[in-house]
């Protein structure tokens, strides 16, 4: 069998919305891969597997099973949402995420996927780290890229 | 229907400490916020803290910081606010209230029925 | 922390008549999202607090609608039109916008 790739192409859109008085923010945080089969076989994504980390804590999970089969030689687009929730102890997030005076309220988040893919009864799994910035002030629309966090931290492709 | 049944009146020495219990009854106690609230005799209302049963996290009022520790237990549903270092000043009443609501739209919905603390030597 | 002052620590009423009460805080509570976060609460002699209004002028489930709210981002009022003997209490505003949670010195219905 030849490699299936999986490449994290970025942050699509977030989209913020806050609790008041809670001092709670809510991402809705959707990612774009893309997963090539270099087979001449069709494989099934069986399953994707996502969270989010900021400050080195959960903030988001999210799991989408039976996504699709890709056919032999042929890459596929995938979108995933992951809900995300800042709060409690980083609820000090809030001020800085709904201040006025500054325009751009980026945070650096780290965006782990794991891809599953099965074929012939094999299972293979891919995982993937980013750090990406979101911006948590305003509903955002990304191009593909754009959110790329790049500093020592960034891991190797 | 909804509950916050709150523990007898307590009877304490200065400098010793009570455990006062709400218990929640009627609802998934998991999913609301539990505060606290002092009121002293003839006084006001004052807002303590407040306890999130499903994750223990918890926010107190700066000035009760060093008097005050809230918990929670969700086996019984039951929230607990412990008072130490017990003054003359910590005699009042202490309600617990359930804040209800959805987001950015809360609000003390139900309250208990009040514990009685006397600090007293 | 915000601070909630209600003027009047009693207001004197017949039955039947309409009475208001007010109250002021140190800082708007009117929010960019359009709500304004001030509250009203009767406790009733020897009772627990009770919820009237929510974010200024929503009415409490199971509240009479002889009791409404009304305001501004920093001047709050509670109305009672034909007030009853039921009524009798102290009504207390409070702000729930930010830590920590504030309540006015209350109000005390009496009926005269």
């Known amino acids: 069998p030849r490699s299936i790739d999986v490449k994290y192409i970025g942050v699509k859109s977030a989209y913020v919305s806050y609790d008041v008085q809670k001092r709670t923010i809510y991402l809705n945080i959707t990612n774009t891969l893309n997963i090539t089969n270099n087979n001449y076989y069709s494989v099934e994504v069986e399953n994707i597997t996502a969270q989010v980390q900021f400050s080195k804590t959960v903030i988001g999970k999210a799991r989408l099973n039976n996504i699709t089969i890709i056919g032999p030689l042929d890459m596929k687009q995938i979108d995933y949402t992951v809900p995300t929730v800042i709060a409690e102890e980083m609820s000090y997030m809030y001020d800085f995420c709904t201040l006025i005076s500054i325009k751009v309220h980026n945070i650096v988040l780290m965006m782990q996927v794991t891809v599953t893919t099965t074929y012939f009864g094999h299972s293979e799994q891919i995982s993937q780290e980013r750090y990406q910035y979101v911006d948590c002030g305003r509903n955002t629309t990304y191009q593909l890229g754009q959110s790329e966090y790049l500093n020592v931290l960034q891991p190797q492709q | 229907q909804v509950q916050l049944q709150q523990s007898g009146a307590e009877l304490a020495k200065p400098g010793a400490s009570v455990k006062l219990s709400c218990k929640a009854s009627?609802?998934?106690?998991?999913?609301?916020?539990m505060h606290w609230v002092k009121q002293r005799p003839g006084q006001g209302l004052e807002w303590i803290g407040y306890v999130n049963p499903s994750s223990g996290y918890t926010k107190n009022n700066q000035k009760f910081k060093d008097k005050v520790t809230l918990t929670a237990d969700k086996s019984s549903s039951t929230a607990y606010m412990q008072l130490s270092s017990l003054t003359y000043e910590d005699s009042a009443v202490y309600y617990c209230?359930?804040?209800?609501?959805?987001?950015?739209?809360?609000?003390?919905?139900?309250w208990g029925t009040g514990t009685t603390v006397t600090v007293s030597s | 922390d915000i601070v909630m002052t209600q003027a009047a620590p009693s207001v004197p009423v017949t039955p039947g008549e309409s009475v208001s009460i007010s109250c002021r805080s140190s800082?708007?509570?009117?929010?960019?999202?359009?709500?304004?976060?001030s509250y009203w609460f009767l406790q009733r002699p020897g009772q627990s607090p009770q919820l009237l209004i929510y974010?200024?002028?929503n009415l409490a489930s199971g509240v009479p609608d002889r009791f409404s709210g009304s305001g501004s981002g920093t001047a709050f009022t509670l109305r009672i039109s034909r007030v009853e003997a039921e009524d009798v209490g102290v009504y207390y505003c409070?702000?729930?916008?930010?830590?920590?949670?504030?309540f006015g010195g209350g109000t005390k219905l009496e009926i005269k």
């Open positions: 974010r200024m002028s």
């Open positions: 209230a359930r804040e209800g609501g959805s987001i950015s739209d809360w609000y003390f919905d139900v």
């Open positions: 409070m702000q729930h916008l930010e830590y920590p949670y504030t």
């Open positions: 800082k708007s509570l009117l929010h960019s999202n359009g709500n304004t976060y």
């Open positions: 009627g609802y998934t106690f998991t999913s609301y916020w």
